[in-house]
């Protein structure tokens, strides 16, 4: 019950983590202008990773995608592909798991093959979380080199004219957005990771020779490495052999004391 | 480095009309465009500007008689001024919000002005 609850949950948040990330790779305020001054332009820009955007006082808002690819910088495009390649993993990830889940019967698949799709989909949700965190996290760093270029050049002049005014850049929504859909996306990928652990069935009966001894009677069957002694079902010496093998289920033997391995 | 400059320019009579011209160099991208005029001693201020879309946003004071316009092929914005007053004088300034190469941050880039006399 514990396991299900684990993965299920583990599942709830991978989706609402992989939601996030792809509101965030889709948002435009990955960052927004600083108003530490308002200068006479009642105008605010504000960026995403695929378009700019400027929003008037009286409420227009219009935005460009950025036409070049060559001319946007590296980071920028490290950035887009971190992101993208976070929500591709996420997706596969969450479709795994769906036929991963310990609630839902697909045909006659065995716990171990549900344990081995749990722990992909774990994987995957990690590393499409950490995808995230690290795009996210890049951009925010080149903000804040942005941030202080601009704020050492705030006025470069020619002639003592005033030619440009360096417009500072802080983190946008999206930003934040990324960050908690990431970390999101990256604990649902370590509670499928430990749901995957209560899934696999353990494998403790080898199956091999089992000797039932008992009294001047000995049965001999293929089944785990159990020796018993006759303290088990058959108490009374009473003749075991019946022509044939049995397998481990079908005798019931009790844990003894004398029991070996 | 964006730049951008600024002409036509000169001495008008009042009711007279003068197109200015701005061209912007270097610049990527600009969100948009807009006028900006200072008259003697006072302070600048916003005249009208243009998105890449084509919408236009004037000062209440100058609508009627300044239309401004652009040319996207060209990187240039014009600003059509009709039946000019004396208290039209002063230096028009063009300013940008553009993107420089290889930056997705625009940034406010301003000419050196042109200027507009106007004599009753």
């Known amino acids: 019950m514990a396991v299900t609850a684990c993965q299920g949950l583990g599942f709830v948040v991978s989706l609402i983590g992989i939601a996030g990330i792809i509101a965030a790779t889709c948002m435009d305020q990955w960052s927004t202008q600083d108003l530490y001054n308002n200068p006479v332009t009642a105008v605010f820009n504000y960026q995403g990773l695929w378009r700019s955007c400027v929003r008037e006082s009286s409420g227009f808002t219009e935005c460009r995608g950025y036409f070049t690819l060559l001319g946007l910088p590296a980071m920028l495009q490290a950035v887009r592909a971190l992101m993208i390649v976070g929500i591709v993993l996420g997706a596969i990830g969450l479709l795994v798991s769906i036929f991963a889940l310990k609630c839902i019967r697909i045909g006659s698949m065995e716990d171990s093959a549900k344990a081995n799709m749990t722990l992909t989909s774990g994987i995957m949700f990690i590393v499409s979380g950490l995808c995230a965190i690290a795009g996210v996290s890049v951009f925010a760093n080149m903000l804040v080199t942005n941030f202080w270029m601009s704020t050492a050049n705030m006025y470069t002049g020619m002639g003592g004219m005033v030619q440009t005014v360096q417009t500072r850049y802080t983190f946008g929504a999206a930003l934040f957005v990324g960050w908690v859909a990431g970390g999101l996306t990256l604990i649902g990928g370590v509670m499928m990771c430990i749901a995957c652990r209560g899934l696999a069935p353990e494998e403790t009966n080898y199956k091999a020779v089992s000797y039932h001894a008992s009294g001047h009677s000995v049965a001999y069957k293929p089944g785990g490495f159990k020796a018993s002694t006759g303290f088990g079902s058959n108490t009374k010496n009473k003749k075991i052999y019946d022509g044939g093998a049995r397998t481990e289920d079908e005798v019931q033997s009790y844990p003894s004391k004398h029991d070996y391995v | 480095q964006v730049q951008l400059a600024e002409s036509g320019g000169g001495s008008v009579q009042a009711g007279g009309s003068l197109k200015l011209i701005c061209t912007a160099s270097?610049?990527?991208?600009?969100?948009?465009m807009s006028w900006h005029r200072q008259a003697p001693g006072k302070e600048r201020e916003f005249v009208s500007r243009?998105?890449?879309?084509?919408?236009?946003t004037y000062a209440d004071s100058m609508k009627a008689r300044f239309s401004i316009s652009q040319d996207n092929a060209k990187n240039s914005v014009y600003l059509l001024m009709v039946n000019l007053k004396p208290e039209d004088t002063g230096k028009y300034y063009c300013?940008?919000?553009?993107?420089?190469?290889?930056?997705?941050?625009?940034?406010?880039?301003w000419g050196q002005g042109t200027q507009v006399t106007v004599s009753s």
């Open positions: 243009i998105f890449p879309s084509g919408k236009t």
């Open positions: 300013q940008g919000s553009c993107r420089g190469p290889g930056s997705i941050w625009p940034s406010d880039y």
């Open positions: 270097r610049a990527t991208d600009c969100n948009y």
